[in-house]
């Protein structure tokens, strides 16, 4: 599955092709780069498009419903999420009942949490309707743990 | 190391206008939210809204909504606060402070700027 | 809106004794609650935030606990330094909400 990763300097995607890729964290433009040894918090989000149908082309990532859809999704994630400590979105996965989007957030550990991550979400749901064209309900979030994430970071800067 | 810097002291009459700037440093300017809190004298902090330098994007605290405009200016890394139509009410300090995300925490502020607002 | 209510709005305590601020939230927001100081004539400085991590160069005598709707900071041993207001803010809804403060004082 491809992944998106937040551009530092630019608005524009990358793409890889491993599974679970982050971007590497000394690549950030910022003054105060994170050293190799910053953690990463994941996230898993899921939630519905309501008014959109799930077909076959959505098990096929070469057709363009696929291809249009994920890039709907990542562009509205680069937006909400813009941008101190976002890293980016993998595994983006289209499941049946309306459609059901499942994807990964990487964040720059220690600068939000859970709820934060859905609240931010939930506030833009009116404007990806009306940018993207997407009515967004059901969305849920929960922690990912993961091996290589030290633990709750007293060393990342606001 | 991050640094915030606003500009200084302003007295204004009720009805004109004032443009606070807030100057940065040591960090990606365009990539973090900048916000905009005020402190009444002896009072508490209000939020009063942010700005994404990267595209402009503002979100504004409904109660400010009308009588301040934020903006910035990427080539010299400085974010301002117009508020117009001053009333004695506006009198205040004014905070920037740098955040992640939309709704996030503030680890970076300004100094602050007093703004008075007085016949 | 999302009301953050502090308590006590004033504490006087004695170098060295332990005190306890609470802030409450009119809704649940899980733990998006951070904590900031503020001296007189300074800027707020961030203390604890997502209502109980740590901040680099924050004294360990601070500390932060709670989730849901009540949340509180605690000075476990007090120094003259530390007299200032004191600020709860979410972060789960928007408007970004603070407390009203509670102002610390040394006997």
């Known amino acids: 599955t491809p992944t998106t990763l937040a551009s530092h300097s630019t608005k524009t995607d990358a793409s890889s092709t491993h599974h679970s890729s982050v971007p590497p964290l000394t690549s950030s433009n910022h003054s105060t780069s994170p050293q190799l040894s910053t953690g990463v918090s994941f996230f898993f989000l899921s939630f519905h498009i309501s008014n959109l149908q799930f077909n076959s082309s959505l098990e096929d990532p070469s057709t363009d419903y696929y291809q249009e859809l994920q890039r709907d999704i990542s562009e509205m994630f680069l937006q909400i999420y813009k941008q101190g400590g976002f890293l980016g979105l993998s595994n983006i996965k289209f499941r049946p009942g309306s459609v059901v989007v499942q994807l990964t957030l990487a964040f720059r550990e220690g600068t939000i949490n859970v709820h934060d991550v859905e609240t931010q979400f939930n506030q833009y749901k009116t404007e990806a309707a009306s940018r993207y064209n997407l009515t967004i309900s059901d969305v849920s979030v929960s922690d990912v743990p993961f091996p290589f994430s030290a633990q709750s970071g007293a060393g990342v800067p606001g | 190391q991050v640094q915030l810097v606003q500009s200084g002291a302003e007295v204004k009459k009720p009805g004109s206008s004032v443009k606070i700037s807030c100057k940065t440093s040591?960090?990606?300017?365009?990539?973090?939210?900048m916000n905009w809190v005020r402190q009444a004298p002896g009072q508490g902090l209000e939020w009063i809204g942010q700005i994404y330098p990267g595209d402009g994007d503002t979100n504004y605290n409904a109660k400010f909504k009308g009588r301040v405009t934020l903006t910035a200016d990427k080539s010299t890394s400085t974010a301002y606060m117009e508020l117009s139509s001053l009333r004695s009410e506006a009198t205040a300090v004014y905070f920037c402070?740098?955040?992640?995300?939309?709704?996030?925490?503030?680890?970076?502020w300004g100094q602050g700027t007093l703004v008075t607002v007085s016949s | 809106e999302i009301l953050l209510t502090q308590s006590p709005d004033f504490q006087s305590v004695t170098p060295k004794e332990k005190v306890t601020f609470t802030c409450r939230a009119s809704?649940?927001?899980?733990?998006?609650i951070h904590w900031y100081q503020q001296k007189p004539n300074q800027s707020p400085k961030l203390l604890i935030k997502?209502?109980?991590e740590s901040i680099s160069g924050v004294p360990s005598r601070f500390s932060g606990s709670g989730s849901g709707t009540d949340f509180t900071l605690s000075i476990n041993s007090v120094e003259s330094e530390d007299i200032a207001d004191y600020y709860c803010q979410q972060s789960n809804n928007w408007p970004l909400t603070f407390g009203q403060g509670t102002k610390l004082e040394i006997k």
């Open positions: 040591g960090y990606a300017f365009s990539n973090f939210w």
């Open positions: 402070a740098r955040s992640y995300y939309r709704s996030a925490w503030f680890a970076y």
């Open positions: 997502y209502a109980s």
């Open positions: 809704q649940s927001i899980g733990t998006s």
